[in-house]
């Protein structure tokens, strides 16, 4: 039996930050679980991990080069990615493992979310014309 995951098909990070919500067909309340976010078509880079345990507060691991935090809902984990770079535009996949109670469960591969990171563009300073000549 596999957990199903729903993600937005695409998100745009205008201010170099984005909230990606992973919605699961499973209630995480009172479970020991590991939710993770993976970058790339082959999911080769694990960007962020959120670990939940009924007996302690949420723990978050963020890979070097990514500023990440997580928030838990009953059937969702939202990843908050900040300080993203334009070259981190890619497809990101949500994964979930439930370790306790048995049986161990994980998810069917989701369709992923394309995160498009828009670069910050500095606005040109307004031109102040000099004093007009009489």
């Amino acid at each position: 039996n596999k957990i199903l995951v729903k993600q937005s098909p695409m998100l745009v990070a205008y201010d170099n930050a984005v909230n990606l919500s992973c919605k699961y067909s499973y209630n995480l309340f009172s479970r020991e679980f590991r939710a993770s976010l993976h970058k790339g078509l082959d999911s080769a880079v694990e960007v962020c991990v959120v670990y939940g345990n009924y007996s302690q507060q949420l723990q978050v691991y963020s890979k070097t080069g990514f500023n990440c935090d997580g928030k838990l809902g009953n059937e969702s984990v939202t990843f908050y990615l900040q300080n993203l770079y334009v070259n981190q535009t890619d497809i990101y996949f949500c994964k979930i493992e439930v370790m306790y109670p048995p049986p161990y469960l994980d998810n069917e591969k989701s369709n992923g979310t394309i995160i498009h990171v828009k670069g910050k563009h500095l606005c040109p300073s307004p031109l102040f014309p000099g004093p007009s000549k009489p």
Partner: nanobody, 125 residues
Framework: EVQLVESGGGLVQAGGSLRLSCATS????????MGWFRQAPGKEREFVAA????????SYTGSVKGRFAISRDNTKNTVYLQMNSLKPEDTAVYYC??????????????????WGQGTQVTVSS
Amino acid sequence: EVQLVESGGGLVQAGGSLRLSCATSGRTFSSDVMGWFRQAPGKEREFVAAINRSGHSTSYTGSVKGRFAISRDNTKNTVYLQMNSLKPEDTAVYYCALRLWSDYLAQKSGEYNYWGQGTQVTVSS
């Protein structure tokens, strides 16, 4: 900070044995999957073996099955790789890796969160 330190590498003749150790510090080791990878000169890092949190479940790459055995001692925060019937093609730098808060026997290097510095294993013919 999490640290992984490998030891036990060295030079051995073909057919010989070595036991690698990887000591971890900086976290509660018993909630993590541990893995061994290796990298030969000019080649990509490849998966060798992994062990789950309890030590009851293991996974191996095909070329080492029946020759290598991974184990762990959660009281000592240490994972081991017993390597028997070594072959010249086992020559590589061996790395241990830690996958946080998991029970999934991952085989991709990108699915591991922390790495040791590696220990050299050389098998002479």
